[in-house]
Structures are given as C-alpha cells and as structure tokens.
C-alpha cells in the first residue's frame, strides 16, 4: 500500500521559518503534488504550492523555494511574519497524485517537544485520504 510521509522542521536561525518535506512511498509515477496548510485542500486548508513534473511549480506566499528533492519527494520553505506566517502547531498536508495508485494525502506538524533546528524523522504520517 502506498504511503505519504510529511516532515516539518523549524529553522534554528529564523523562528518564523519552517521547512516542509514530503515524500511518496509507492511504485507509481507522480503526476502532481499539492502542499497545503491549515488542513487538507477542500477541508479548510490553503494551497501553498503545486508541483508538476513537467508543467513546473507554483507557490504562494509565505511559501518559498518549493522544489523536487527526488522523483518522489519535495520540499519547500515557509517564511514571513505577521498573520500569514506559520506557527508551531500549524498543520501541513501533502497530496500526491500518482498513476496507477490514485491520490494519497497525509498531514503533519511540528513535534510538540522539538527545539528549533530539530524535527521529527520523516516517518509515514497517517493517511487521511486515498481517492
């Protein structure tokens, strides 16, 4: 069964800066990745970035530097201050559309005990939806 993992890390140098990494553990080819915060897209979340292997990448503030790390994992940085910047308990979700598995989504947030600069290991997060 495919799985999605989500890792959230607060940068030690910039307390309002977060790095989000997501990956897809499956054999299919990925056609689209959507990253959101505040919950899944369509369930109160806000799109932060959309990554397509051929059509490119779009990102919306406060997201910066959204990129493919491998063929099956992505990362992006969130930075900023004020109302549109993340806080420690913000939920981040990644949805991977792949063929032939379909769409798989998982969410994660900063571990409560983590210090700046530390993060939870990138273990699979609970799968919220498989379309």
């Amino acid at each position: 069964t495919p799985e999605v993992w989500v890792q959230v890390r607060m940068e030690a140098t910039e307390l309002s800066s977060f790095t989000i990494r997501c990956g897809f553990l499956g054999s299919g080819s990925i056609s689209l990745v959507t990253v959101s915060w505040g919950g899944p897209n369509g369930a109160g979340g806000t799109t932060l970035a959309v990554l397509h292997p051929e059509r490119g990448i779009r990102q919306w503030a406060p997201a910066r530097q959204a990129r493919w790390e491998t063929q099956s994992s992505i990362s992006l940085i969130l930075e900023g201050s004020g109302a549109s910047s993340p806080c420690a308990n913000t939920t981040f979700c990644c949805k991977f559309a792949s063929f032939p598995e379909g769409s798989w989504e998982a969410c994660g947030s900063l571990p409560p005990s983590s210090d700046p600069g530390l993060s939870a290991p990138p273990t699979p997060a609970p799968i919220l939806r498989a379309d």
């Epitope: 505040g38 919950g39 897209n41 369509g42 109160g44 979340g45 806000t46 799109t47 959309v50 397509h52 059509r55 490119g56 779009r58 919306w60 503030a61 910066r64 549109s84």
Partner: antibody, heavy 119, light 106 residues
Framework: QVHLQQSGPELVKPGASLKISCKAS????????LNWVKQRPGQGLEWIGW????????FYNEKFKGKATLTVDKSSSTAYMLLNSLTSEDSAVYFC????????????WGQGTTLTVSS | DIQLTQSPSSLSASLGGKVTITCKAS??????IAWCQHKPGKGPRLLIH???TLHPGIPSRFSGSGSGRDYSFSISNLEPEDSATYYC????????FGGGTKLEIK
C-alpha cells in the same frame, strides 16, 4: 467556461465605505486563489491582495492593508472587496482575477468595476 | 518587494511588423513572468506565463523569452487588434506589474 462577473459602477462620497462583488462561475470556486487589482485613470495595474476561497485565507499588498478587506461567500461563489475611508485616491477601476495555478497567474479577469469618489 | 522596469512606455509600429518589449526585475525571478494585454473598457487578458508558455487560444505570433532578471516579449505580424497596453507581471514572490507599454499600430 470560466466567467467572473463584477458589480456595476459606483459613485460614492469621501469617507464612505463600499463593497464590490465578483461572482465566479465555470470552475470550482474554492480551489483557486482570487486576486484584486487596481487601475487608477491613466495609470498602470497594482495588485491589492488575494483570497483563497476554500479557507478564506488572505494576503495583502502592504500598501492596501487597512484600506481593503477581502471576503468570500462560498455558497454563492462570490468574492467581495470592502474599501473603507474612501478618498479621491481610491477612484479607479477595480478588477477581480483568478490565479490559474500551473495554468498561470491571472488567467481569467472580471470586466472591472469603476469607482468614483466625489462629493 | 520585487520591482519591474518595463520599456518602452509607448511605441508605434507598422501593420505586419514586429515589436519587442522588455522587462527587468530588481532580482532573479526564476522565469516567473507573465505578459498581459489590456484594452480600454475591458478586463486584461493573459497572453504568456512562465516566460514563454502561451496561454490557450493565444496565437504563436506572441512570444516571450528571458531568464534571471531580464525578460522580453515580442509580437510579430502585427495586426490592427494588437493596439493595446501590455504589462509584464512577476509572480515569483507575491505579484508585481511593470509600468505598461502602450502599443499603437500604424
């Protein structure tokens, strides 16, 4: 067919507030950012801010913070922009425009709403 | 904020000819530039995004190129309906428009 239909022209007095509407059709309203753009007479285009209708999350150009407030009514697929404490500097044409994501920014535009602020 | 300097601010060209408009960003915008056409009394129309990708339905006589901070937009085989104001727009971070170029076809 994507369509953004804006409310009609307005003549208001200085100091008043005004809410402009933008009714979206032909796509899933909650899935795309909706932006507002200002054009003063004889001048260029200025981005005011955006709203993501699915979550009602907003982001404003610093210049328009406190001047514009963006909201949506998901049940009617309508976006609104409230402009307050109006002055002659706010006299302009205001456009709503959809961000198409990977299809490009501002892929569909409303026809514009002309606002005249005059006593 | 990212600034865009668009030039020229106006130009006149002959029917069937070619024009080029340039846009310079205050920093690298990673090819996230779009070009719009605006005619009086109408909403603007997206022509090109991501430097050179034509929006559906836009004829191939419109083209764009560039990278880093420097970008250009061209129209060849000019037609009467190309008379309009053209804007560049960066969307690498937030959104900023260039000052516009008013094109007149002779």
């Amino acid at each position: 067919q994507v369509h953004l239909q804006q409310s009609g022209p307005e003549l208001v007095k200085p100091g008043a507030s005004l809410k402009i509407s933008c009714k979206a059709s032909g796509y899933t309203f909650t899935d795309y950012y909706l932006n507002w753009v200002k054009q003063r007479p004889g001048q260029g285009l200025e981005w005011i801010g955006w709203i993501f209708p699915g979550s009602e999350s907003t982001f404003y150009n610093e210049k328009f913070k406190g001047k514009a407030t963006l909201t949506v009514d998901k049940s009617s697929s309508t976006a609104y922009m409230l402009l307050n404490s109006l002055t002659s500097e706010d006299s302009a044409v205001y456009f709503c425009t959809r961000d198409g994501g990977l299809r490009g920014p501002f892929d569909y535009w409303g026809q514009g709403t002309t606002l005249t602020v005059s006593s | 904020d990212i600034q865009l300097t668009q030039s020229p601010s106006s130009l006149s060209a002959s029917l069937g000819g070619k024009v080029t408009i340039t846009c310079k960003a205050s920093q690298d915008i990673n090819k996230y530039i779009a070009w719009c056409q605006h005619k009086p009394g109408k909403g603007p129309r997206l022509l090109i995004h991501y430097t050179s990708t034509l929006h559906p339905g836009i004829p191939s006589r419109f083209s764009g190129s560039g990278s880093g901070r420097d970008y250009s937009f061209s129209i060849s085989n000019l037609e009467p309906e190309d008379s309009a104001t053209y804007y560049c727009l960066q969307y690498d971070y937030l959104l900023t428009f260039g000052g516009g170029t008013k094109l007149e076809i002779k």
